[in-house]
Each structure stands twice: as C-alpha cells, then as structure tokens.
C-alpha cells in the first residue's frame, strides 16, 4: 500500500506566440482545480477508461480576477498535494490524466459553472520511494508544471512497495536467504512463507502460502518446465545434451496482448500497449460504466453496470460532449435573428432584440407589411426592421398617399423647362440641347452625337419622358 | 569482492559457432534479483546488448539476433554461458559479460560490475 | 526498436569546465543509465536509475532527465574524466545505447 502524490507548480500560459485569453474576468471571476486520474500500466489514456489506480480532486485555487488588458498569467493554484492512495502494489508503470477545471463564480443560475481548460496526459515508469520527478506537459496554448511521486506506507517497502521490513537482527547481514530492503536502509526484508515445496528458483508468493510461478514454469510448486519437449519442437528450450540451440519462448510470442495490443518485451517480463478504450495488463479490460462516474457536469448516467455495456451522458444546458465535458457556447451558434444579442445565462439563452423585432429568437418584424396597404397602388416592401412602401408614378410619401410633383427634383438638364403631365413629365429643352431630359448636346452641323431622333421629333422639340 | 571474466576462442572462421563462458564471483545467481547479461563492441564502435538470464532462468534476447544466441546458466559452478551460431566477420568484436541486478519484479537496478572483455576476430 | 541519440559525439573540453551530455531517446524510457569508458577498458557504471550515482563514482557526476531526454554533467572535469560516455535505456528489447560521446582535452 502507499500514496501518488502530485503537486501542481504551475498552470499558465505556454512558450510561444498565441497566448491564451485569461478563462476569468471581472464580469465573471474564477478559481482552478484539478482532478488526476492514474491507470495501471502504460496502456494509452484514454480520458473514458476508468481510473482503476485511483483519482483525487484537488481543493478550489483562490478566485482571480483578471487584470483588463493584461496577458494571460499564472494562474492562483489550489494549496496542497493531490494524494492518490492505492491498497495493492504500486505497479511500476502508469497512465496519468491530468485536468485543470475552471469553476466561474459570476451570477450563476442554479450554482457554479464548470468547465474544462486543459487536459494533459502521459505514461511514466516509476519506482515508489523515489525522488519527486519533474514535469512539464502542454495542452494548446497552457502549460502545466507539475512534480509526482509515489511512496510507500509502512511497513511496506521496495520500488513496489510489496516487501515489508523490519530491523536487522544483526548489525552486518539479514538472515539467511533475506535481503536488505535497500542498499542502504537499515532494515531487512520480512520473510514471506509461500507454500511448503514452492520452488525457490521458479516460484514466489506475494500472500503466505501461495505459489505463483514464473513465466515458463507451471506446476503447484513451479517444477514443471511450461515446454517439455526436447528440439523437435521449434520453441523448445535450449537442450545443453543436444546442443540444441533453439531459445526458449518469449514472453511476447503468441501476443499475449489482447483486444489489438502490442507487445513489447521488457527486461524480466513484457508489456502491452493498449488501443484506445482498453486498459489493464494483457489489454483485457475493456468499457467504462455509470458505477466508473464518467457524467461531468451533473450530467445523468445511463447504461448496464457490467463492463461491456456502453453508457451514455445526457447532459444538462449548456454541456456537451461524450462526458459532459465541454461547456457550450451556444451564443457561438447565432441563435439571435434579425443583429438581437445573445445572452448566454448557462440555463437559458436570452435574445436581446433590436427596435422593430420581437420573439425568443428575435424573428418577428414589428413592422412588417401584414395589415398594412400602400395606397394607390404602392406594394409593400419588408427589410431592415421596417416596411416600406414602393410608389407608383406620380406619388410618394410613407404610405403613398402624397401625389408626386415630377418637376420637384428639377429633372431637366441644361435649363430644360419641366412640365407635369399625366403619364410623368415633359422637358423642354433649351436650343442646342435634345433628349428625355435634355442631356444631350446638339452639334452645331447639326447632326446629333446620337443617332438621330425618333421620327415626328425634331432638335428643340420637347422631349417627353416615358 | 565481485569479479566477471570472459573466456572462449579469440579467432572463429565464419558460419562457426562461437561459444563463450562468463564465470563470476561475489554473487550468486541463485540469489534473487540478480542477472547477467552479454554486451559486445566492434572495434571503434558503440556497445551492443545481445541477452541476459536472471536467477530464475527468464531470458531476453536481441531481437536481431535471437535466432542465432542462447544463453544458459550453471548456478553451481558461477557460470553463463553465450553460444552464437553461423559466425560472421561482421561478429568481430570484444564480448563482455556483465552483472545485473533488479531490485523490482520488471525494472533493471544496475548493470553495475563488467568483466575485461574478450575480442574474437572472425576470420577465414 | 528505442533508438538513443546521444550529443554532442565529440567535445573537447578541458580540466575545471562543466560539461553537459546529453541522451534523446525515440521514446519515452523513463530511466537512464550512464557509462564511462576509457580505451582498451571496459565500461564502468557511472549512473543508474536516472540520477543515482554508482558507489565509488564521485560527486561531481550526476544525471537527470525524464521521459525522452537525459542529461549527464560533469561539474568539474578531471584529468582522468576524458573517455567515452554511453547512455542506454532498460525500457524494451532490445536494450540499446547510445553511440556514445567523446570526451577530449582540448
């Protein structure tokens, strides 16, 4: 038994350019935590398998609020070590996950929103007893500084914390066939009774009484050879009689990884490289359940409680992702018509409409044509929050009820003279000018510096504009 | 005080067996948590791990030459024995034997005390 | 296979300096071993464990390092420092080493 601790150094803004916005601010301050999460072996860490070493959830750090226009800094980090205890052997090798929340303490409705600002994670060789072992791990544009060890508690010792110790009975040596704890402690290795007969070469126990044996030897005591053929068969073990020179099996041979994992012999025994979703030793353990609390955010759990049914989290406003991770920004979605601003209040979205336009989504037009008629003959035109309506000749004004002097906007061109007519207007046009609205020159031969002017008018004569 | 000493033929022609015998004292390898292990060097170049046994008679060995080694162990007489089948001249190098001690069931303490070394030339 | 990249290959330094050498690995070892190798000699365990000097090294060696990358520091050299050094990692068969750095008078 014994204890992984973690302590954060800190949590901030990454080398580089692209810093990150501070996650607080003054309208809405903040605090950190972090949750580990540690898994057997080195297996890859994938964030949905269970934490079968253990997790620990750090205190919340100091609320901090940001400085308006200042970089991302440090952040204020929680006080403490995380401390992740494990009852059985520390196994030497391990996947960790790493998560800094953010907890916002602005006006929330229904309590404090979580979410979630970066996520690190590794595999690490470790022996227990060790010195603190230094780290520093990027997710986008944070990086987090952080040391971990794991220490045994007594009376277990070792870099697996599996052998326990006691005093040396001598002040030299330890009894026979016991070890000193380490070099230099002052203690010896307590002594383990396995089963009576249990070989001393090929066996050992971690319990009193038990015989576990080693790879390539099976047996109640371990005496039996896994393999005893001789060199007919192509693994057999090496034969000194026959000069045999066949080695014996591997223990990667046959994969002993299951479920696609890959096998990588180590110095006394071998280790699987898991896919994603599978974790343990071989590979062999496989799903995460509701029992494994996988639902952030309050989300709700549902699926069977053995492993190979799958779960799912159905998360509340505002949440989403597989575990309820990811807080939404549902304002990022423009759900607001019409330029409303949205208003994200974490269990509602608000719209915020502009003058003339009304709605939950700011779709309904105030001012739209319905109900409204343009008089003589005017048709409605909808857009920018009020209607308008489109005139026919000879009026004007909002609604069309204003008749239209045509001449108002003095149409003729080089002194033309303008008259109403029924039909629009008449320009006549002053001498050496022709056209509707008397915008051409007459040449003085003259020919027109237009072709020639439809027939019955000539140069001078008024112009009527159609 | 603890010694290793490496000892086999100093010339082999090719396609020969060379087999060499590391004998030690100052441990046992009946003694839970030690090993020895096999290291050569060509002439001029960097070290090379061919294989280790451990006191419980687990064996590793170099994947591009596992077909070739076989390393046995006589706890008795303090001895490894390396033999590598279909010698080459490329083979050329001093072998070395060292001690190895793991403290944990899977992480290698030391390899703290090395014999002197023995060069075998492979040559026709 | 791990494959261990050691820098520089060659360094010319000399008596009283601080020298730094340094071991990349191809992927994550975790723990780092150190050997120091004089010509016609065989190689002597220097560090073990990442940063645990072997009995009989002195002081002034000393190793750290995690994950990918490992360092080995001489704090002072010694006349009887120059010699090739070696990294090797105990991660995964097969067990290799570096190709080792050389350390000169200059």
């Known amino acids: 038994a014994g204890v992984f601790e973690l302590q954060i150094h800190s949590f901030g803004p990454g080398p580089g350019p692209g810093a990150p916005r501070s996650p607080c601010s003054a309208r809405l301050p903040c605090r950190l935590f972090f949750r580990v999460c540690l898994k057997p072996g080195l297996s890859e860490e994938a964030a949905e398998s269970p934490c079968a070493l253990g997790a620990a959830l750090s205190a919340r750090g100091p609320v901090y609020t940001e400085q308006p226009g200042a970089p991302a800094p440090d952040l204020p980090l929680p006080d403490g070590l995380l401390q992740v205890p494990f009852r059985d052997a520390w196994p030497g090798t391990f996947s960790f996950i790493i998560e800094t929340w953010r907890e916002e303490l602005g006006d929330q409705i229904g309590g404090p929103a979580w979410s979630l600002l970066a996520r690190v994670a590794g595999r690490r060789r470790l022996a227990a007893g060790g010195p603190w072992a230094r780290d520093i791990q990027r997710a986008g544009a944070w990086e987090l500084r952080f040391s971990y060890r794991a220490r045994c508690e007594p009376p277990a010792v070792g870099t697996a914390c599996t052998r326990l110790c006691r005093p040396r009975s001598a002040p030299s040596r330890c009894g026979p066939g016991l070890r000193p704890c380490a070099p230099l402690e002052d203690e010896c290795e307590a002594p383990l009774v396995c089963r009576a007969g249990c070989s001393p070469e090929h066996g050992f126990c971690e319990q009193p009484g038990e015989c576990r044996c080693l790879e390539g030897w099976t047996g109640p005591l371990c005496t039996v050879p896994v393999s005893t053929s001789s060199c007919l068969s192509p693994r057999g073990p090496s034969s000194a009689t026959t000069g045999c020179l066949v080695p014996g099996p591997g223990p990667c041979d046959g994969n002993p990884c299951a479920n696609g994992g890959s096998c990588s012999e180590t110095p006394r025994s071998f280790e699987c490289t898991c896919p994603r979703g599978f974790y343990g030793l071989r590979c062999e353990v496989s799903g995460v359940t509701c029992a494994d609390g996988p639902c952030f955010n309050g989300g709700l759990c549902v699926g069977g409680a053995d492993p190979d049914s799958a779960y799912i989290c159905h998360c509340p406003p505002g949440f989403q992702g597989s575990n309820c991770e990811k807080r939404v920004d549902r304002c990022s979605l423009q759900p607001c018509r019409n330029g409303g601003l949205c208003l994200d209040l974490g269990h509602a979205l608000r719209c915020r409409c502009r003058a003339g336009f009304a709605g939950p989504r700011c779709e309904h037009d105030l001012d739209d044509c319905a109900g409204r008629a343009c008089a003589n003959g005017g048709t409605c035109v909808e857009g920018g929050g009020a209607h308008r309506c489109s005139c026919a000749l000879g009026f004007g004004g909002r609604d069309c009820r204003e008749r239209a002097d045509p001449c108002a906007a003095r149409p003729c061109a080089h002194g033309g003279r303008c008259y109403a007519h029924f039909s629009g207007l008449v320009c006549a046009c002053a001498p050496g000018y022709m056209g509707a609205r008397c915008e051409f020159p007459v040449h003085p031969d003259g020919a027109s510096a237009l072709p020639a002017a439809p027939p019955g008018l000539r140069p001078g004569d008024p112009q009527r504009y159609l | 005080q603890i010694t290793l000493k490496e000892s086999g033929p100093t010339l082999v022609k090719p396609t020969q067996t060379l087999t060499l015998t590391c004998t030690f004292s100052g441990f046992s390898l009946s003694t839970s948590g030690m090993g020895v292990g096999w290291i050569r060097q060509p002439p001029g170049k960097a070290l090379e791990w061919l294989a280790h046994?451990?006191?419980?008679?687990?064996?590793r060995y170099s994947p591009s030459l596992k077909s070739r080694l076989t390393i046995t162990k006589d706890t008795s007489k303090n001895q490894v024995v390396l033999t590598m089948t279909n010698m080459d001249p490329v083979d050329t190098a001093t072998y070395y034997c060292?001690?190895?001690?793991?403290?944990?069931?899977?992480?290698?303490?030391?390899?703290?005390?090395w014999g002197q070394g023995t060069l075998v030339t492979v040559s026709s | 296979d791990i494959q261990m990249t050691q820098s520089p290959s060659s360094l010319s330094a000399s008596v009283g300096d601080r020298v730094t050498i340094t071991c990349s690995a191809s992927?994550?070892?975790?723990?780092m071993y150190w050997y120091q190798q004089k010509p016609g000699k065989a190689p002597k365990l220097l560090i073990y464990?990442?940063?645990n000097l072997a009995s009989g090294v002195p002081s002034r060696f000393s190793g750290s390092g995690s994950g990918t990358d490992f360092t080995l520091t001489i704090s002072s050299l010694q006349p009887e420092d120059f010699a090739t050094y070696y990294c090797?990692?105990?991660?995964?068969?097969?067990?290799?080493f570096g190709q080792g750095t050389k350390l000169e008078i200059k």
């Open positions: 046994i451990w006191w419980d008679d687990v064996k």
């Open positions: 060292a001690r190895i001690v793991s403290f944990d069931n899977d992480v290698v303490s030391a390899m703290d005390y």
């Open positions: 464990l990442t940063h």
């Open positions: 992927s994550s070892v975790s723990y």
């Open positions: 090797q990692q105990w991660r995964s068969n097969p067990f290799t």
